[in-house]
């Protein structure tokens, strides 16, 4: 039972529509068939779980219906998208990967992606 390395980009800027995407890549030491991916957010000395999904290798990630996250997997990479972000959601988003099956259990936690969210300026009234 060991730790594994998880890589993710240092910084991502959310789109004007409040959508941020980043890749979470893990160095799988074995042939995992069941993987759990959790996105954590650290801000103001507090860590909260943003979303989590368990998937079988080769299948799509399935988040809860009301989740703000979506994602796809390809080999040892997970492409994560977080939507509905506002400026107050700016923070460090951390990718946590667990290889659940078969044993042994492996755990890896990335260094985090700082996501910056800038609320769009409201459009000025126009006569046109």
């Amino acid at each position: 039972c060991k730790a594994m390395h998880v890589a993710q980009p240092a910084v991502v800027l959310a789109s004007s529509r409040g959508i941020a995407s980043f890749v979470c890549e893990y160095a799988s030491p074995g042939k995992a068939t069941e993987v759990r991916v959790t996105v954590l957010r650290q801000a103001d000395s507090q860590v909260t779980e943003v979303c989590a999904a368990t998937y079988m290798m080769g299948n799509e990630l399935t988040f809860l219906d009301d989740s703000i996250c979506t994602g796809t997997s390809s080999g040892n990479q997970v492409n994560l998208t977080i939507q509905g972000l506002r400026a107050m959601d700016t923070g460090l988003y951390i990718c946590k990967v667990e290889l659940m099956y078969p044993p042994p259990y492996y755990l890896g936690i990335g260094n985090g992606t700082q996501i910056y969210v800038i609320d769009p300026e409201p459009c000025p009234d126009s006569d046109f």
Epitope: A3, T38, Q46, V47, E49, N111, G112
Partner: nanobody, 130 residues
């Protein structure tokens, strides 16, 4: 398989001392974070103290100056020396391993820091009461 086994808990009077131990096996990663957490009845788990693989230590404000964390690498054992115990220290104490040392020093000042740890012992109960 990783195993963490805590011991040393018990009933102690206010102002007394206890030394908790956590014997670890099955974990071979060299760069990691070891921590002590506690969970009082009806409350969430909170980080008490952490120690990095390099030996840097960190403490929650509520235990600073009273608790001391240490490790014996030769014995694969983590310790928590608890002095000047108070009734509010009553809780189940857990040791844990975190795989990323980046989050080690800040854990005792961070709510929800348990998310950074993935391997847990079964816990040992500490009761401070007269």
């Amino acid at each position: 398989e990783v195993q963490l086994v805590e011991s040393g808990g018990g009933l102690v009077q206010p102002g007394g001392s206890l030394r908790l131990s956590c014997a670890a096996s099955g974990y071979t990663y060299s760069r990691h974070c070891l921590g002590w957490f506690r969970q009082a009845p009806g409350k969430g788990r909170e980080a008490v103290s952490t120690i990095s693989s390099g030996g840097s230590t960190s403490y929650a404000d509520s235990v600073k100056g009273r608790f001391t964390i240490s490790r014996d690498n030769a014995k694969n054992t983590l310790y928590l020396q608890m002095n000047s115990l108070r009734p509010e220290d009553t809780a189940v104490y857990y040791c844990a391993i975190g795989p990323n040392p980046r989050y080690c020093s800040g854990a005792p000042q961070t709510r929800g820091a348990e998310h950074y740890f993935g391997y847990w012992g079964q816990g040992t109960l500490v009761t401070v009461s007269s």
